[in-house]
Interface confidence: low
């Protein structure tokens, strides 16, 4: 993905169909890479990042990631192509809606991770377990 | 039921200005970007400009831009059309719409308000 | 910007009959191309999305084919609330262009 500062020219109404017909078209999503970040022990956070950029490529989604060591915590928020790994890691809840942390494993850090796919949804990040396909709030936003 | 209520059309002399307001209902309002469309008295449709659903982003039509400005308060589900220096050739009817989710839809317009006329004229 | 031309601009046509509305877009726009069906004095609807997928709610005489630059809008068989204008859009590239509309007539 090209950043929002080095992106000459977009289409944010172009079409890609997905394996089940659904129809998709470049996404908007919060895009300021790595920043330091103060959220820590909460259901959720706001990314706090003011860059919203269209996505280069229609199939692309939006991608949170949260990373605390002993030294800082950082919020990475970037587009990817769900069918490319990201950090080592497949993007398994592309489809979502909402942006729903999950922890992954890696050595020496506390690290979580969500993708989601409406527009600037990794915005808005959420650690709860609250936040499950059986919450009547998400499947709200799913199907409305 | 989704629901794209438009306001503050009017009459407006030429260089005046005039802000148009579309208050939505029945959907997550945040989560959608919108849009305005334009049609003239007796002509086809013309795309005016889109806002990201935070109002981070914005994108206008040339024929509009420097002149109108897009904005949106998710507090009250609310978007705003600001026009100024309108022209004659302004003179339209101004939809508010809603830039269908890629699980509904092509990032075209899949709600309508019913639309609220703007008469540019001295 | 890509043009898309519409035609006819105009059609009279009775109720039962098949009606057929063409679009052609100024270059290449894969199926990214949407029908919207406007009455007067009312907003557009949309009809038909990427070409051939039917929106939702709208009933299945409406159908949508092409590819390309070509596309086109069938009503098989008309119905009286089917007398309107009717849209081709481009989803392509920004800003999104619309056709200039066909009007289709009680004949």
């Known amino acids: 993905t090209i950043p929002p500062h080095v992106q000459k020219s977009v289409n944010n109404d172009m079409i890609v169909t997905d394996n089940n017909g659904a129809v998709k078209f470049p996404q908007l999503c919060k895009f300021c890479d790595v920043r330091f970040s103060t959220c820590d022990n909460q259901k959720s956070c706001m990314s706090n990042c003011s860059i919203t950029s269209i996505c280069e490529k229609p199939q692309e989604v939006c991608v949170a990631v949260w990373r605390k060591n002993d030294e800082n915590i950082t919020l990475e928020t970037v587009c990817h192509d769900p069918k490319l790994p990201y950090h080592d890691f497949i993007l398994e809840d592309a489809a979502s809606p909402k942006c729903i942390m999950k922890e992954k494993k890696k050595p020496g850090e506390t690290f979580f991770m969500c993708s989601c796919s409406s527009d600037e949804c990794n915005d808005n990040i959420i650690f709860s377990e609250e936040y499950n396909t059986s919450n009547p709030d998400l499947l709200l936003v799913i199907f409305q | 039921e989704v629901q794209l209520v438009e306001s503050g059309g009017g009459l407006v002399q030429p260089g005046g200005s005039l802000r148009l307001s579309c208050a939505a209902s029945?959907?997550?309002?945040?989560?959608?970007?919108m849009t305005w469309v334009r049609q003239a008295p007796g002509k086809g449709l013309e795309w005016v400009s889109v806002i990201s659903g935070s109002g981070g982003t914005t994108y206008y039509a040339d024929s509009v831009k420097g002149r109108f400005t897009i904005s949106r308060d998710n507090s009250k589900n609310t978007l705003y059309l600001q026009m100024n220096s309108l022209r004659a050739e302004d003179t339209a009817v101004y939809y508010c719409?809603?830039?269908?989710?890629?699980?509904?839809?092509?990032?075209?317009?899949?709600?309508w308000g019913q639309g609220t006329l703007v008469t540019v004229s001295s | 910007d890509i043009q898309m031309t519409q035609s006819p601009s105009s059609l009279s046509a009775s109720v039962g009959d098949r009606v057929t509305i063409t679009c052609r877009a100024s270059?290449?726009?894969?199926?990214?191309l949407n029908w919207y069906q406007q009455k007067p004095g009312k907003a557009p609807k949309l009809l038909i999305y990427a070409a051939s997928s039917l929106q939702s709610g709208v009933p299945s005489r409406f159908s949508g084919s092409g590819s390309g630059t070509d596309f086109t809008l069938t009503i098989s068989s008309l119905q009286p609330e089917d007398f309107a204008t009717y849209y081709c859009?481009?989803?392509?590239?920004?800003?999104?262009?619309f056709g200039q509309g066909t009007k289709v007539e009680i004949k």
């Open positions: 270059q290449s726009i894969s199926s990214y």
């Open positions: 859009q481009q989803s392509y590239s920004t800003p999104p262009t």
């Open positions: 029945g959907f997550t309002f945040d989560i959608y970007a």
């Open positions: 719409a809603r830039r269908g989710q890629y699980r509904d839809i092509v990032g075209a317009t899949d709600y």
